[in-house]
Interface confidence: medium
């Protein structure tokens, strides 16, 4: 039997309605009708399109290999898509009402099928071995035999779309990738230059060959010298960049338990046993949980003070058939060992306490209804967002932190987190949220420290 979590759902919808009322910009897709389809779609975040009948709704596009059957019934609901029939395909995210027809390889052009048509990609046509594609138009090509370079040597081998490049022997010149005897060269033709007697054609500056060898050597030595100076300085002054120092100077860096640089949030946070360093005094209140054990609703409540912990699992044994979520820490602080991994790893972008505070302030400051859009703007792919959301399926806040942390890990260290976040929020017309984030960082609430993993 499905165990419903209705209060959580109702609350979500109420909050969504509030967001609509207070902040029309706070909900994606509340836009006036525009005739031009492309203009309308630009009003939705990447990977979404404007509902065909209700331009206040943004629906998720269909995955490649599928086509649109019906628009999403409401925001947050999935679009109904169907897989392309045999002989048809869609190669990218789309909202096409039907799939595209697969192309057939043209035998009369000597084409062969490299890979058959699949639901998510068109037929790939190519040429046999030792043939290349000679394009007759932008899309049509003919397969032609590669030149064997008789009376010459191969400079560049035959490629997919390019014939062999030949270097002709003396007494031959190149014409359409073939080495032709100079006797075929007529006066006033380009080949005259190539078919001149050797003494005239082959006058080179004796210095040239020496320069050609010496110059690269000089450059190489210079680079080696610079690298040596750089490494010496790094090892002498490790304060400059501890990360680089530890990598170059081979300073032993202890790495505990797991691979270095794993996400800070435990995957996906098992409930803490008394030994795991869980401090009961850190627990927040637990709204949304009532005494009946069998099908207690889960209520995801927003607001920094409402993220809460459950008692360690070892203290409560679930009765059979009970909702497992009852016995799970819905949003648990990552165990101290997880943070240890960060601190001990040679990860070039481990977040310091200031960074952690910023990430948590961002998590609390961006409206949940706009979170995914925010992460897309930050550069996370739809697939990555979805994976992290599923992986932290019981806790929105943990999922959000994981996403931000994934973004931070692949962002150059010199890029200021707040600056990037500020730019993105401004782009999303959420400058007010940025102010709230800055305010929260200026005046951290006494409880906020408990939210930071130690």
């Amino acid at each position: 039997m499905g165990l419903p979590t209705v209060p959580g759902l109702l609350l979500s919808l109420v909050l969504l309605a509030l967001l609509m009322g207070i902040h029309p910009s706070g909900v994606t897709g509340l836009v006036p009708s525009l005739g031009d389809r492309e203009k309308r779609d630009s009003l939705c975040p990447q990977g979404k399109y404007v509902h065909s009948k209700n331009n206040s709704i943004c629906c998720t596009k269909c995955h490649k290999g599928t086509y649109l059957v019906s628009d999403c019934p409401s925001p947050g609901r999935d679009t109904v898509c169907r897989e392309c029939e045999k002989g048809t395909f869609t190669a990218s995210q789309n909202y096409l009402r039907q799939c595209l027809s697969c192309k057939t390889c043209r035998k009369e052009m000597s084409q062969v099928e490299i890979s058959p048509c699949q639901a998510d990609k068109d037929t790939v046509c190519g040429c046999k071995e030792n043939q290349f594609q000679r394009y007759l138009s932008e899309t049509h090509f003919q397969c032609v035999d590669c030149s064997p370079c008789f009376n010459g040597t191969v400079t560049i081998p035959c490629k997919e779309t390019q014939n062999t490049v030949c270097n002709c022997h003396a007494g031959f010149f190149l014409r359409e990738s073939e080495c032709v005897p100079c006797s075929h060269c007529k006066k006033n033709e380009e080949c005259m230059k190539l078919c001149l007697p050797p003494p005239l054609a082959n006058v080179t500056n004796p210095q040239d060959s020496g320069t050609a060898v010496l110059l690269p050597l000089v450059i190489l030595l210079g680079l080696c010298l610079l690298s040596f100076i750089f490494i010496s300085l790094m090892c002498r002054y490790p304060r400059w960049r501890p990360e680089v120092y530890s990598i170059i100077c081979r300073d032993p860096v202890p790495v505990k338990e797991e691979k270095a640089g794993k996400p800070l949030t435990p995957a996906p946070s098992p409930a803490f046993s008394p030994t795991s360093g869980f401090n009961p005094t850190l627990g927040f209140s637990t709204p949304g949980f009532s005494s009946p054990v069998s099908s207690t609703p889960i209520s995801p409540i927003f607001g920094p003070s409402n993220w809460h912990f459950m008692p360690p699992v070892s203290e409560v044994v679930p009765t059979q058939g009970a909702d497992p979520l009852l016995y799970e820490s819905l949003c648990s602080v990552p165990a101290p060992t997880s943070v240890q991994k960060w601190e001990d790893s040679a990860h070039p972008q481990r977040p310091d306490n200031a960074d952690l505070a910023i990430l948590y302030a961002v998590v609390d400051g961006v409206p949940p209804a706009r979170w995914k859009e925010f992460m897309r703007f930050m550069g996370l792919s739809e697939h990555e967002i979805e994976r992290l959301e599923m992986q932290n399926g019981r806790c929105l806040r943990e999922a959000q932190y994981s996403m931000l942390e994934a973004w931070r890990r692949r962002t150059p260290r010199h890029e200021d987190t707040l600056e990037v976040v500020g730019l993105v929020l401004s782009k999303m017309n959420l400058a007010g949220c940025l102010e709230n984030i800055l305010e929260a960082l200026r005046n951290p609430a006494p409880s906020s420290t408990t939210r930071l993993p130690r």
């Epitope: 499905g2 165990l3 419903p4 979590t5 959580g8 759902l9 979500s12 919808l13 909050l15 969504l16 269909c62 995955h63 490649k64 290999g65 599928t66 409401s74 947050g76 609901r77 999935d78 679009t79 109904v80 898509c81 169907r82 897989e83 998510d120 889960i298 995801p300 949940p368 209804a369 979170w371 697939h383 979805e386 959301e389 599923m390 932290n392 399926g393 019981r394 929105l396 999922a399």
Partner: nanobody, 120 residues
Framework: EVQLLESGGGLVQPGGSLRLSCAAS????????MSWVRQAPGKGLEWVSG????????YYADSVKGRFTISRDNSKNTLYLQMNSLRAEDTAVYYC?????????????WGQGTLVTVSS
């Protein structure tokens, strides 16, 4: 009424295989992403794998990547989890979970679970 009914659990030796099924009813199955989540004895919940509504994108936890395969048959309203090369640490109650239609909570319905025991 939304119902999710898991089956296919049982006792299996390490290295063995099992196929779990989750029969869904009471909602438009093909419109929602689905996930498998497990709870080992005395431990917390661990998300195992997820699949999008059309069955085109699949997601796995690192601990099961390469061993487990999630799939779905929308015509039969059924979610599957093929588990190969099973290990003792895969012993758990496996739940299938439906993706929420509201913001922001990812799952809004869970099944009652099916017990998988990996032991020699």
């Amino acid at each position: 009424e939304v119902q999710l009914l898991e089956s296919g659990g049982g006792l299996v030796q390490p290295g063995g295989s099992l196929r779990l099924s989750c029969a869904a009813s009471g909602f438009t199955f093909g419109s929602y992403s689905m996930s498998w989540v497990r709870q080992a004895p005395g431990k917390g919940l661990e998300w195992v794998s997820g699949i999008d509504n059309g069955g085109h994108s699949t997601y796995y936890a690192d601990s099961v990547k390469g061993r487990f395969t999630i799939s779905r048959d929308n015509s039969k309203n059924t979610l599957y989890l093929q588990m190969n090369s099973l290990r003792a640490e895969d012993t758990a109650v496996y739940y299938c979970a439906k993706r929420s239609s509201g913001l922001p909570f990812p799952f809004d319905y869970w099944g009652q679970g099916t017990l998988v025991t990996v032991s020699s």
